[in-house]
């Protein structure tokens, strides 16, 4: 079974080389009962969702824009 | 057809066991989450448990932990829920839920898109 | 545990009128969240999920939206089929929750 439905994970797998440009939001979900990784959630301009690696430099600092531009709103 | 068929409710005295049964057909059943929600007569829905696709992790609500125990035979796509030590309060319609939602090959969301016709639990004496 | 708090919980409307529905969750749940449709005496249908996404094979008058704690389900122009009770629920986090349900009645 997958990480996603052995758990209640909703990242099978993350994936690699998005543009932060094609991305409108994103969520971060931590550890819990329902799944014991982090899990980064990103809803692209298109609409559809992507998960991201939460280890990846790129990745973090996506978060990191995303939390600073929340924040200066 | 994707389909799920209750069974093994009815009548119990309080402090009674009962095991409920969901037979499942029309999908490749080890794949999904199952889940159970209960409504009482003339209530919401509430969510009781929920089990994942090997069986190896299940999710109880506070109000039935340590009382009921929910468990998957995936060779016979059988879903079960085992309820000892039963209340009053816990008389209700008693629904099986899969949980679907494969969105992106690398996002999943737990929808329960398909259900039982439910079977009813009476707790009285 | 997640709260899921459903307004109103009746509501009475005509067939050709437009309703919304809202649902508010006590911590930000993202769009995690999905709207049932139950029916008397039947097991409840899946009309949303994620939020915004229209389940298939359901009527484009029905929409959802929101994100975070604050989500609202629409139907565009009433029809006799829609008279029910509609609930929403959170899968962010187990216990998954339910609101309490809003009834549409036919005024």
């Known amino acids: 079974a997958s990480v996603a439905t052995e758990l209640r994970c909703q990242c099978l797998q993350t994936l690699q080389g998005i543009h932060p440009k094609n991305i409108q939001s994103v969520n971060v979900k931590s550890p819990g009962p329902h799944c014991a990784q982090t899990e980064v959630i990103a809803t692209l301009k298109n609409g559809r969702k992507a998960c991201l690696n939460p280890a990846s430099p790129i990745v973090k600092k996506i978060i990191e824009k995303m939390l600073n531009s929340d924040k200066s709103n | 057809e994707v389909q799920l068929l209750e069974s093994g409710g009815g009548l119990v005295q309080p402090g009674g066991s009962l095991r409920l049964s969901c037979a499942a057909s029309g999908f490749t059943f080890s794949e999904l989450s199952m889940s159970w929600v209960r409504q009482a007569p003339g209530k919401g829905l509430e969510w009781v448990s929920a089990i994942s696709g090997s069986g190896g992790s299940t999710y109880y609500a506070s109000s039935v932990k340590g009382r009921f125990t929910i468990s998957r035979d995936n060779s016979k796509n059988t879903l079960y829920l085992q309820m000892n030590s039963l209340r009053a309060e816990d008389t209700a319609v008693y629904y099986c839920?899969?949980?679907?939602?494969?969105?992106?090959?690398?996002?999943?969301?737990?929808?329960?898109?398909?259900w039982g016709q439910g079977t009813p639990v009476t707790v009285s004496s | 545990d997640i709260q899921m708090t459903q307004s109103p919980s009746s509501l009475s409307a005509s067939v050709g009128d437009r309703v919304t529905i809202t649902c508010r969750a006590s911590q930000s749940i993202s769009d995690n969240l999905h709207w049932y449709q139950q029916k008397p005496g039947k097991a409840p249908k899946l009309l949303i999920y994620?939020?915004?996404n229209l389940e298939s094979g359901v009527p484009s008058r029905f929409s959802g939206s929101g994100s975070g704690t604050d989500f609202t389900l629409t139907i565009n122009s009433l029809q006799p089929e829609d008279f029910a009770t509609y609930y929403c629920?959170?899968?962010?986090?187990?216990?998954?929750?339910f609101g309490q349900g809003t009834k549409l009645e036919i005024k």
């Open positions: 839920a899969r949980e679907g939602g494969r969105l992106e090959p690398y996002y999943y969301y737990y929808a329960m898109d398909v």
């Open positions: 629920q959170q899968y962010y986090s187990t216990p998954l929750t």
């Open positions: 994620d939020a915004s």
